[in-house]
């Protein structure tokens, strides 16, 4: 799996995890988050060359079709697979809100 | 939905479908398909502005995230969202065969 | 709170030798990758060199390939760089970053340690 346990230790150009720390101020411009002030969220990045990690029939083809093409730009992207929450807590004037926000950290990688 | 009837209608530079005809023989180097000679398989491209058909609450950080830190390369990518079969016709020796191959036509997309 | 000291720049003539050291806290440095980036007077940053969570990988710019060395030590959350054969456009001020910096530019910590080559 194209996941932390991989990805951090091999560093490569392939499609991989790469770590991604976001502040929510400084990064993204949210004040209204209390806690966490921010996460690890991670991304996917990297070429996705024949048979690396594909996702579905259509990226081995398109890869495939890429390799035997290289001047087309038609190439299978890395992109998120396995993603999980964040919890958070923020406030509606004095009152505190713990809410899950789903989809927030990226785990693991697929070329798709 | 970024999709032929509006991706094929509305050329742009953001995430869309864009058409790709693959010929097996010439293309991939498949001389083992011997109908359809080739398909409509098409493929994603684009770039992922903030909140251009974001597939996940992770992608549309990212694309907040790229929008304020333009410098970083950490963006969605466009990629496949819904995938249709492909009807072939092959032979084993003198025997023909009808095979149904998955995801093998991208039909919309989406930033992920 | 994620922190990142770098230090060991300094003057040295083209041709020499100097050794970088990147102090990190505030996060579990054995668990990610870790870069070293430099910024040129009136450059942007300029990726330097990767090294994988247990030190097994690295990858070099080709503009360093074969004179520098990238290296770590997770039980003292520390990272190095050896820079040897130092030409006068190695001049830059460098910074250790958490991460594939290869991937997420324009992205430091810490103030960066000044490395001057100059004779």
């Known amino acids: 799996a194209l996941d932390a346990a991989y990805c951090f230790r091999n560093v490569q150009d392939n499609c991989c995890l790469r770590p991604l720390y976001i502040d929510f101020k400084r990064d993204l411009g949210w004040k209204w988050i209390h806690e966490p002030k921010g996460y690890n969220a991670n991304f996917c990045a990297g070429a996705c060359p024949y048979l690396w990690s594909s996702d579905t029939q259509h990226s081995r083809v398109l890869s495939l079709y890429n390799t035997i093409n290289p001047e087309a730009s038609a190439s299978p992207c890395c992109v998120s697979q396995d993603l999980e929450p964040l919890t958070i807590l923020y406030y509606i004037g004095k009152t505190p809100k713990i809410e899950q926000l789903s989809n927030m950290i990226v785990k693991s990688c697929k070329c798709s | 939905a970024l999709d032929a009837a509006y991706c094929f209608r509305n050329v742009q530079d953001n995430c869309c479908l864009r058409p790709l005809y693959i010929d097996f023989k010439r293309d991939l180097g498949w001389k083992w398909i011997h109908e359809p000679k080739g398909y409509n398989a098409n493929f994603c491209a684009g770039a992922c502005p903030y909140l251009w058909s974001s597939d996940t609450q992770h992608s549309r950080v990212l694309s907040l995230y790229n929008t304020i830190n333009p410098e970083a390369s950490a963006s969605p990518c466009c990629v496949s969202q819904d995938l249709e079969p492909l009807t072939i016709l092959y032979y084993i020796g003198k025997t023909p065969k009808i095979e149904q191959l998955s995801n093998m036509i991208v039909k919309s997309c989406k930033c992920s | 709170q994620l922190q990142l000291v770098e230090s060991g720049g300094g003057l040295v003539q083209p041709g020499g030798s100097l050794t970088l050291s990147c102090a990190a806290s505030g996060f579990t440095f054995s668990h990610y990758p870790m870069s070293w980036v430099r910024q040129a007077p009136g450059k942007g940053l300029e990726w330097v060199s990767v090294i994988g969570s247990d030190g097994g990988t690295k990858i070099y710019s080709d503009s360093v390939k074969g004179r520098f060395a990238i290296a770590r030590d997770n039980a003292k959350n520390t990272l190095y760089l050896q820079m040897n054969s130092l030409k006068p456009e190695d001049t830059a001020v460098y910074y250790c970053?958490?991460?594939?910096?290869?991937?997420?530019?324009?992205?430091?910590r810490g103030q960066g340690t000044q490395v001057t080559v100059s004779s």
């Open positions: 970053a958490e991460g594939d910096s290869r991937y997420v530019r324009g992205r430091t």
